[in-house]
Amino acid sequence: GSMGHAPKVGRLIYTAGGYFRQSLSYLEAYNPSDGTWLDLADLQVPRSGLAGCVVGGLLYAVGGRNNSPDGNTDSSALDCYNPMTNQWSPCAPMSVPRNRIGVGVIDGHIYAVGGSHGCIHHNSVERYEPERDEWHLVAPMLTRRIGVGVAVLNRLLYAVGGFDGTNRLNSAECYYPERNEWRMITAMNTIRSGAGVCVLHNCIYAAGGYDGQDQLNSVERYDVETETWTFVAPMKHRRSALGITVHQGRIYVLGGYDGHTFLDSVECYDPDTDTWSEVTRMTSGRSGVGVAVTME
């Protein structure tokens, strides 16, 4: 990536890291308003299976692993990217390495959920306070989950699907910060590990993933009022280990693995028409990216 100053632009979709033949250090940003991609400062260490989030205008890369010809190292790292300076800086590491992690943000705090360290599948969850640069464990999930999708709705943290070390999961659970406890919610219609999970219009969406046999293109959404999962239009491509985010009322899914190919495809879902469309391609195919959108 280039090390010059990043252009001062509006809301961008950032994609960090990923995997193609080895873990990647790319940081790139897509501008949906003009369809352009920016090549930004590389991660200091390549990583795949990471998660991305934005707090206070800063992009955070959380966990993952560096799978390279020299070896394979799960990551406990938290790194912070400042779009104004186009620079990465390390923050306090998590208590344990977490590959194929999920993250969510509540009240400016980052929650790191599940993931794996070697063959250990975590149910543990920890919270990062940026102002103190500190991590603290909170209540563990009821289920061990890697490849878990995480989303925040109404200040509640949802952990959806994943792999517990034995089975891929259709179960989901919800964390109540005030009570510091997890409760199971209605299971999805479909087993999904490595799905993309996000929130749009008061619903939690779970897109794609892997059911233990095949990659999926199906998409379902959870209505917190009715506590039910309902299928919506499927994506054009089957994909697991995809990136996902929401930008201006639409869902964007980035890359992933379809069982044969590392996808460069980026699809966009319009909830008004219940349709998916191909909007762009990443500069190269990859799975296991961390994705987030800058705030206004």
């Epitope: 070697g118 063959c119 089975n167 697991s240 069982g259 799975s287």
Partner: antibody, heavy 118, light 107 residues
């Protein structure tokens, strides 16, 4: 019945290449991590490479990294090991194996012998 | 890399004997250890996974146990078909590694 059948072994000169195949039946390779494990004559077992069906990520032993490539074709239900820049120390019987969820391999092929010699 | 030190490298025993094979991991591997049996010219066969779980179809005379970083495969009453080489394997961390093997021979 779950079955794995390797093929593609043979005699090759140092620096040469071979592609091993592992044809699966009785299960879908898209449902399991596939590993290659080798055994030099009269020696023990050595893990070589694996491929994850969910993420597509591959792992390699340091002794083969950069020279060997593992892949899978789910339409043919077959896994492959492309071996380049072969060395005398790569001489071994090569087995493919299916990993069960608990990180152990519960189904193995019969093996295919690779001999690297001039 | 994690070393799996297997002992003994060979042993002689009689039908009906109780046989114990040990693997010691050079660092913690949790319970991510499997045991395999291999006969000459054949592929390995899974006996035990997760340190102590008996794989389906394996006779109950085989058992596995763990004490810290020490792992034991026990054959409670050796049968003629059990004369073979046995390997342990750790899959706790990359790369997966095997013990050097224990050859069980007829006394």
């Amino acid at each position: 019945e779950v079955q794995l059948v390797e093929s593609g072994g043979g005699l090759v000169q140092p620096g040469g290449s071979l592609r091993l195949s592992c044809a699966a039946s009785g299960f879908a390779i898209s449902a399991s991590s596939i590993h290659w494990v080798r055994q030099a004559p009269g020696k023990g077992l050595e893990w070589v490479a694996s491929i994850d069906p969910e993420t597509g990520e591959t792992l390699y032993a340091k002794s083969v990294a950069g020279r060997f490539t593992i892949s899978a074709d789910t339409s043919k239900n077959t896994a492959y090991l492309q071996m380049n820049s072969l060395r005398a120390e790569d001489t071994a019987v090569y087995y493919c194996a299916r990993e069960r969820a608990e990180y152990a391999s519960d189904a193995w092929g019969q093996g295919t012998l690779v001999t690297v010699s001039s | 890399d994690i070393q799996m030190t297997q002992s003994p490298s060979s042993l002689s025993a009689s039908v009906g004997d109780r046989v114990t094979i040990t693997c010691r991991a050079s660092q913690s591997v949790s319970s991510a250890v499997a045991w395999y049996q291999q006969k000459p010219g054949k592929a390995p066969k899974l006996l035990i996974y997760s340190a102590s779980s008996l794989y389906s179809g394996v006779p109950s005379r085989f058992s596995g146990s763990r004490s810290g970083t020490d792992f034991t495969l026990t054959i409670s009453s050796l049968q003629p078909e059990d004369f073979a080489t046995y390997y342990c394997q750790q899959s706790y961390s990359f790369p997966s590694t095997f013990g050097q093997g224990t050859k069980v021979e007829i006394k």
